[in-house]
């Protein structure tokens, strides 16, 4: 089956998408975009804002295989793809394009993973090797960070405070996090 | 690289609660998935709960349900586990450990050194 | 609750072979259960040797090797030595929810 024409590095691009992590600069087949519902009041000064809600940052749907060495998921998986610029929501543009709205001495930010999600996936193996399961990491939202400029010049910062969060969530679901008994006496899964 | 570093030893009297703190330094906790793993002196481990990045909950194994919580705070990159109503029997040694932030999710990858928790009247 | 049981002690003599076993009360071990096994000795923190059946670790010596054998899931030490000498435990994971084995010592005579 050609095994050898998928990637080692746990990626197997569809055709007609960018190789990840390359951020796509226009919409193609098989992505849609997804603007972070952020919402807020726009901030006086793109710099003064102390509200994270204010900012960001573009969520892009990307779809593709996984691989394992020679062994490659059943299925596809779709995960996102943080991409662009961050900036006030109320300037970002509806088509990814590049729009400048920051000075050019102001601080920078940048578009990166904010939660991941965990996705069971089978891999598939070649020459009747035994399939293998795997818990695949996926993006699941994308968050706005600030590069610090009077540190390490490849160092993010939060932008805003974060609080202690009791029951974080990470996936895209209500925030209130559950907790669950161990299942393990109620199934026989497998 | 991932380190967990756990909070020191702790003496309780029966009926008290404990905190156990784990800091997490080479990865921001949002980045991991924390677990909770205990030892009584001279037996086997026992998983108490942790984070499941599958459905984005904390599950806690049945028979500490109603009697653990754990949680994180972000800012400091430290998750804390508290027990309470503690028993003699609760007297162990409490490992934090996570993932290795990974492609691939493959937990209890990093362990804490542990916290020694004695329950004594 | 889900039980898991694991052989109480093996003896191994240095440089042979041994093989320890994982299994589920609820059934046959399969790859979902992702398999773990790790080391323990006295007075340390245990040490991931094998996940999601047979991953290996960079720490992990290749005499070292994870299965599923006959419903459950093994690990085999091909070629004994004396600090293999400890404590083995094996991990399923049921749904997000774990179990631990009871653990094997194991013994390098």
């Known amino acids: 089956q050609g095994w050898q024409a998928f990637k080692n590095d746990a990626t197997e691009i569809i055709p007609g998408l960018r190789e990840y992590p390359e951020p796509p600069q226009e919409l193609e087949n098989n992505q849609t975009m997804n603007r972070a519902e952020n919402g807020g009041r726009p901030p006086h000064h793109p710099y003064d804002t102390k509200d994270v809600s204010e900012y960001s940052c573009r969520e892009l749907h990307y779809t593709r295989f996984v691989t394992d060495g020679p062994c490659r998921s059943a299925k596809p998986v779709t995960e996102l793809v943080c991409s662009g610029q961050c900036g006030p929501a109320r300037l970002l543009p509806n088509a990814i394009g590049r729009v400048k709205w920051w000075r050019p001495n102001g601080p920078d930010f940048r578009c990166i993973p904010d939660r991941y999600r965990a996705q069971r996936v089978q891999l598939l193996c070649p020459g009747g090797a035994a399939p293998r399961s795997r818990k695949v990491r996926l993006v699941a939202s994308c968050k706005c960070k600030r590069l610090t400029r009077f540190h390490n010049q490849s160092e993010l910062k939060d932008f805003g405070p974060e609080t202690a969060r009791p029951q974080k969530g990470r996936k895209p679901r209500p925030r209130a996090r559950g907790a669950k008994a161990n299942q393990a006496e109620l199934e026989n899964a497998y | 690289e991932v380190q967990l570093v756990q909070s020191g030893a702790e003496v309780k009297k029966p009926g008290a609660s404990v905190k156990v703190s784990c800091k997490v330094s080479?990865?921001?906790?949002?980045?991991?998935?924390i677990h909770w793993v205990r030892q009584a002196p001279g037996k086997g481990l026992e998983w108490m709960g942790g984070f499941d990045p599958e459905d984005g909950e904390t599950i806690y194994a049945q028979k500490f349900q109603g009697r653990v919580t754990m949680t994180e705070d972000t800012s400091t990159d430290t998750a804390y586990m508290e027990l309470s109503s503690l028993r003699s029997e609760d007297t162990a040694v409490y490992y934090c450990?996570?993932?290795?932030?990974?492609?691939?999710?493959?937990?209890?990858?990093?362990w804490g050194q542990g916290t020694l928790v004695t329950v004594s009247s | 609750q889900a039980v898991v049981t694991q052989e109480p002690s093996l003896t191994v003599s240095p440089g042979g072979t041994v093989t320890l076993t994982c299994g589920s009360s609820?059934?046959?071990?399969?790859?979902?259960?992702?398999p773990y096994w790790f080391q323990q000795k006295p007075g340390q923190a245990p040490r991931t040797l094998i996940s999601d059946t047979d991953d290996k670790h960079s720490w992990t010596p290749a005499r070292f090797s994870g299965s599923l054998l006959g419903g459950k899931a093994a690990l085999t030490l091909s070629g004994a030595q004396p600090e293999d000498e400890a404590e083995y435990y094996c991990l399923l994971d049921y749904g997000g929810s774990f179990v631990f084995g009871g653990g094997t010592k194991l013994t390098v005579l």
């Open positions: 080479g990865y921001t906790l949002s980045e991991l998935s």
């Open positions: 609820t059934g046959a071990v399969t790859i979902d259960h992702y």
């Open positions: 450990a996570t993932d290795s932030a990974g492609y691939w999710y493959k937990f209890f990858q990093h």
